[in-house]
Interface confidence: low
């Protein structure tokens, strides 16, 4: 089928000890090959500091996945979610504390 770019959605949730968990979800994309990773200061975090979900079919002939990491509250600006799919790439910031989601559809 033709390429369908992912919808990327970044959320944050409070964690203990002054940390927050940030999750980057990519959905409704085809084909299933995708790079999704958290970056700090523009550099990908090591694998052992991130958690990935499986790339799963979402029932519409497209796919979804996610990646999460835990960061210090107040350091949000240093982190971005990097997505690469079918030759296109984009970066997505962590939303500020008073706004709990942020999503873009990339063409």
């Amino acid at each position: 089928g033709s390429t369908v770019p992912p919808m990327v959605n970044v959320t944050r949730s409070e964690a203990s000890e002054g940390n927050i968990t940030v999750t980057c979800r990519a959905s409704s994309f085809y084909p299933r090959n995708i790079i999704l990773t958290w970056r700090q200061d523009g550099v990908s975090l090591s694998h052992d500091t991130q958690q990935w979900g499986d790339v799963l079919p979402d029932g519409n002939g497209t796919y979804q996945t996610w990646v999460a990491t835990r960061i210090c509250r107040g350091e949000e600006q240093r982190f971005t979610c990097y997505m690469e799919h079918s030759g296109n790439h984009s970066t997505h910031p962590v939303p500020s504390g008073n706004s709990h989601h942020h999503h873009h559809h990339h063409h």
Partner: antibody, heavy 121, light 107 residues
Framework: EVQLVESGGGLVKPGGSLKLSCAAS????????MYWVRQTPEKRLEWVAT????????YYSDSVRGRFTISRDNAENTLYLQMSSLKSEDTAMYYC??????????????WGQGTSVTVSS | DIQMNQSPSSLSASLGDTITITCHAS??????LSWYQQKPGNIPKLLIY???HLHTGVPSRFSGRGSGTGFTLTISSLQPEDIATYYC?????????FGSGTKVEIK
């Protein structure tokens, strides 16, 4: 070969201003975070300021926030540090340094030769 | 702010000795620690990044270990050209902070 060449240092009176420059070559300047670090006469290293690759984010140490401004010109491959309201405790050697990128995460992998700033009446 | 407690402040060792320098972070910095060598009259140079990764061109007698709050730099078979001051730097949280330095001399 990565090269970072600082300029603009000198002797300035308290309350005065200076603008430091750092000319970068040998790498894709716009792809990397850039930093200013200073070394005091006692040889202590102090981080001063950081600017992100896309000019989106800047960070400052508490000791210079509101007085110093870091900026970059990606077209000219140049990093700047505008310093104002200078104090005697700003006397130091100022180094421009390059963020490590994917080959050296969370590190400053190349440093310039430094430019000396002396604040004295 | 994260404090970096580096020790010892100076040490004297014989050629061929193995020496260890320690940095202790006041908070968990994962592996966001790098080590620098500054020879007399020269500029700082990166030795180790990510706590344990040797920077390009650095001799293999240098090694780094640690994660969380405790980190070490080891120089095995000390050479005359290793006379220098060594600094650690944490990159986990702003403000970035350096250790106070360890001056290494030959007996």
């Amino acid at each position: 070969e990565v090269q970072l060449v600082e300029s603009g240092g000198g002797l300035v009176k308290p309350g005065g201003s200076l603008k430091l420059s750092c000319a970068a070559s040998g790498f894709t300047f716009s792809d990397y975070y850039m930093y200013w670090v200073r070394q005091t006469p006692e040889k202590r290293l102090e981080w001063v300021a950081t600017i992100s690759d896309g000019i989106t984010y800047t960070y400052y140490s508490d000791s210079v926030r509101g007085r110093f401004t870091i900026s970059r010109d990606n077209a000219e491959n140049t990093l700047y540090l505008q310093m104002s309201s200078l104090k005697s405790e700003d006397t130091a050697m100022y180094y421009c340094s390059k963020g490590g990128g994917s080959t050296a995460r969370g590190a400053l992998d190349f440093w310039g030769q430094g430019t000396s700033v002396t604040v004295s009446s | 702010d994260i404090q970096m407690n580096q020790s010892p402040s100076s040490l004297s060792a014989s050629l061929g000795d193995t020496i260890t320098i320690t940095c202790h972070a006041s908070q968990n910095i994962h592996v966001w620690l790098s080590w620098y060598q500054q020879k007399p009259g020269n500029i700082p140079k990166l030795l180790i990044y990510g706590a344990s990764h040797l920077h390009t061109g650095v001799p293999s007698r240098f090694s780094g270990r640690g994660s969380g709050t405790g980190f070490t730099l080891t120089i095995s078979s000390l050479q005359p050209e290793d006379i220098a001051t060594y600094y650690c730097l944490q990159g986990q949280s702003y403000p970035l902070t350096f250790g106070s330095g360890t001056k290494v001399e030959i007996k």
